[in-house]
């Protein structure tokens, strides 16, 4: 029978660490991490890490009992967890019978949004207490709410990942810019900033009809030339406060009729908060 892995949590040092070993298995040949999505009962989905590793093809894998994988996550707070993946059989060949290196994977470490992860792996038995053992590590940065997969997560949807404000902005005259955008039921308070290297104007927008999606309009006084300036619209939603996803547009000249026309270069950009 071919070896497979059985993985379970192991937070402390492996028991083998306390034992003296004449020889230890060789190091891993490769370690990779990629995100995978899994459905959860709430109708949402979670993102998990698919950690895969390749064993070196030589006789040292005959000593191999397990591979331990530890993940440290750094975002607003630090997390640390480890799993130990035991091999179910002793290795009878250095490569798979069908050809290629022995490759295994573990899917289970949860992925939070916009977090840097450090993934380390080493074979067991590992090095003796005062020795450096072979190990491999990789970094993995999880995407934020603007990612094509992440944006459908409930947390991201509540932060406005699917909201398209369709911003239009035009220069009415030397002193004012008219900004129009589509509101969202996610919140009723917005901040519109006009920037041309520096902030040349801003306005708070309060939209009382929060439950309806309407088109809001605000005229903003400016203190400099506004043509070509950037409009930044910052929403304030309950889930993300002042760190919600921000949207951008560009100020153009108003048509003679005074009606601003839509732009096709609307851009979204994360604020400080990429949940």
């Amino acid at each position: 029978r071919e070896p497979t892995v059985q993985c379970g949590s192991e937070t402390g040092p492996s028991p083998e660490w306390m034992l003296q070993h004449d020889l230890i298995p060789g190091d891993l040949r490769d370690l990779r991490v990629e995100p995978v999505t899994t459905s959860v009962a709430t109708g949402d989905y979670s993102i998990l890490m698919n950690v895969s590793w390749v064993l070196r093809a030589d006789a040292s894998i005959r000593l191999l009992k397990a591979t331990k994988i530890c993940v440290t996550g750094k975002s607003n707070f630090q997390s640390y967890s480890c799993v130990r993946c035991n091999y179910t059989e002793a290795f009878q060949t250095q490569t798979r019978p069908s050809g290629g290196k022995w490759t295994f994977s573990y899917i289970g470490f949860p992925v939070e949004l916009n977090t840097v992860y450090f993934i380390g792996a080493h074979n067991i038995p590992n090095a003796n207490m005062n020795e450096d053992g072979p190990s491999m590590s990789v970094n993995f940065t999880s995407p934020g709410c603007l990612d094509h997969i992440m944006k459908y997560k409930k947390k991201c949807v509540k932060a406005g990942s699917l909201w398209d404000p369709n911003i239009t902005a035009c220069k009415k005259n030397e002193e004012t810019v008219e900004v129009n955008f589509t509101t969202t039921p996610l919140g009723n308070r917005y901040m519109a900033l006009i920037q041309h290297s520096t902030i040349i104007g801003f306005s708070q927008v309060f939209e009382p009809h929060q439950k309806k999606q309407t088109r809001a309009s605000v005229v903003i006084p400016v203190t400099g030339d506004s043509e070509g300036a950037t409009v930044q619209l910052t929403p304030y939603f309950p889930t993300c406060g002042s760190d919600c996803i921000r949207h951008k547009g560009t100020v153009v000249l108003c048509p003679q009729t005074g009606v601003p026309f839509p732009l096709d270069n609307n851009k979204s950009k994360p604020g400080g908060w990429l949940p």
Epitope: A57, D58, A59, S60, L63, Q94, T95, R96, S98, G99
Partner: antibody
Framework: EVQLVQSGAEVKKPGASVKVSCKTS????????MNWVRQAPGQGLEWIGR????????QYNQKFKDKAILTVDTSISTAYMELSRLRSDDTAVYYC???????????WGQGTLVTVSS | DIQMTQSPSSLSASVGDRVTITCRTS??????LAWYQQKPGKAPKLLLY???NLGDGVPSRFSGSGSGTDYTLTISSLQPEDFATYYC?????????FGGGTKVEIK
């Protein structure tokens, strides 16, 4: 029946290169590493290196790192070893040898004599 | 690299004799050892692997023993076709090395 058939003897001048082939049959080529071993006249055996036909990973004996280049053509189940900058002390019989479950050499080619002489 | 010391380098024996060849490694190779027989002008032939397992078609008069750093090839009753050179090889991990060889000659 597993067979490894090597190309014929070669006579080369110093500084030249030679490419030795090892045509295999009777097993799944990509499932086993292929090793190359050298035996100088009247001498013992020296391991040159090995290649995994599955993904062309190569591991060399440091001594031969700048001397030998190992390749495979999986479409015709053939391994190759090219020796460059030949010198008279490269005169030897060169063997291809297929690994077993681990790197014992279960099957050997008949050997290719490479003679380097001016 | 792991060093392989094979002894003796040559020996003379008669048909029917019991012959023992030893191989010492510079470090523990956990029985990852093979023995080969080579006749003049021919490729080596696998006799034993994993120190004790017989290769395909190898007569049972050949046997292997040992562990750690000391290994032995024994021919229980030497036959005329056994006059050849014998090599040990470790396959613990690259680079693989061979012993210097033992030439078994007719006394």
């Amino acid at each position: 029946e597993v067979q490894l058939v090597q190309s014929g003897a070669e006579v080369k001048k110093p500084g030249a290169s030679v490419k030795v082939s090892c045509k295999t049959s009777g097993y799944t080529f990509i499932s086993y590493w292929m090793n190359w071993v050298r035996q100088a006249p009247g001498q013992g055996l020296e391991w040159i290196g090995r290649i995994d036909p599955y993904d062309s990973e190569i591991q060399y004996n440091q001594k031969f790192k700048d001397k030998a280049i190992l390749t495979v053509d999986t479409s015709i189940s053939t391994a190759y070893m090219e020796l460059s900058r030949l010198r008279s002390d490269d005169t030897a019989v060169y063997y291809c040898a297929r690994s077993g479950g681990f790197d014992w050499f279960a099957y050997w080619g008949q050997g290719t004599l490479v003679t380097v002489s001016s | 690299d792991i060093q392989m010391t094979q002894s003796p380098s040559s020996l003379s024996a008669s048909v029917g004799d019991r012959v023992t060849i030893t191989c010492r490694t510079s470090e523990n190779i956990y029985s990852n050892l093979a023995w080969y027989q080579q006749k003049p002008g021919k490729a080596p032939k696998l006799l034993l692997y994993d120190a004790t397992n017989l290769g395909d078609g190898v007569p049972s008069r050949f046997s292997g023993s040992g562990s750690g750093t000391d290994y032995t090839l024994t021919i229980s009753s030497l036959q005329p076709e056994d006059f050849a050179t014998y090599y040990c090889q470790h396959f613990w991990g690259p680079p693989y090395t061979f012993g210097g060889g033992t030439k078994v000659e007719i006394k």
